[in-house]
Amino acid sequence: ESGYAQNGDLEDAELDDYSFSCYSQLEVNGSQHSLTCAFEDPDVNTTNLEFEICGALVEVKCLNFRKLQEIYFIETKKFLLIGKSNICVKVGEKSLTCKKIDLTTIVKPEAPFDLSVIYREGANDFVVTFNTSHLQKKYVKVLMHDVAYRQEKDENKWTHVNLSSTKLTLLQRKLQPAAMYEIKVRSIPDHYFKGFWSEWSPSYYFRTPEINNSSGEMD
């Protein structure tokens, strides 16, 4: 009797949309890599659903993901990082949907950190610096960074600057005087690897000096 119920569940499952997306993070914990997958539809009933990756692995044929709330996650040294793997959503032994993916084309870098802004009075500019863990990595070393800043009162008026280094100079005359600014930065693989933008760094806030009335320049 329970057999019929399970078959019915499976038939119901086949009507659902199990499309999913994944991203990899290389050398995220020493020499360990991670792979994170999640369903596109947040309302999918994930009970009894499992993810499995097969192919392009070292020493093993397949690996199962761990489920962490609504995401599925693997941390391992066993990714070959050459060729395509098959990632499948499964119920028991039955695959509901699969994707062939080269893990080096879905790389999401770690977020930059230690963002700071220093005002140089003599140069009349602001030096923006930040750090990234990728400078120390063997694989994903070359990144494009997106620095975004806005006047705090302009909620959606972000100015974006793309750069490959971790240092940027903002000219004082390009900013409003006596204003509070918010700035943040994110990264994307730029060479040898493909993928997605990292999460944003924590925002940094800085204030521009007031205008000096006698000279017309900012203080």
Partner: nanobody, 118 residues
């Protein structure tokens, strides 16, 4: 219809060097992994080296690590195997393969013969 063509094989003395080339006419070359294999006389196929689509990731078998180098030029649709410090046991037919898809190489060349004389 010929899709992978190896070249560069020949007769070389022990301790010498050779550079093998494999040119691909497969449209997805620049996004495909590539590999080199060899078959020694009377032996099975042995994997030697592999390289990811961009050239950033490479792997080698223990038998050639430190002596052989795999590289690729995506503008020329070509993968290379630089072989240094050759030994008599490196003698065999060398094959390149393309598109490592779920543990199966999808395309194979006809091979090029390498003979190392001692």
């Amino acid at each position: 219809e010929v899709q992978l063509v190896e070249s560069g094989g020949g007769l070389v003395q022990a301790g010498g060097s050779l550079r093998l080339s494999c040119e691909s006419s497969i449209s997805t070359f620049s996004s495909d992994a590539m590999g080199w294999f060899r078959q020694a006389p009377g032996k099975g196929l042995e994997w030697l080296a592999a390289i990811g689509w961009s050239g950033a990731v490479t792997h080698y078998s223990d038998s050639v690590k430190g002596r052989f180098t795999i590289s690729r030029d995506n503008a020329k649709n070509t993968v290379y195997l630089q072989m240094n410090s050759l030994k008599a046991e490196d003698t065999g037919r060398y094959y390149c393969a393309e598109d490592y898809d779920t543990d199966v190489w999808q395309y194979w060349g006809q091979g090029t013969q390498v003979t190392v004389s001692s």
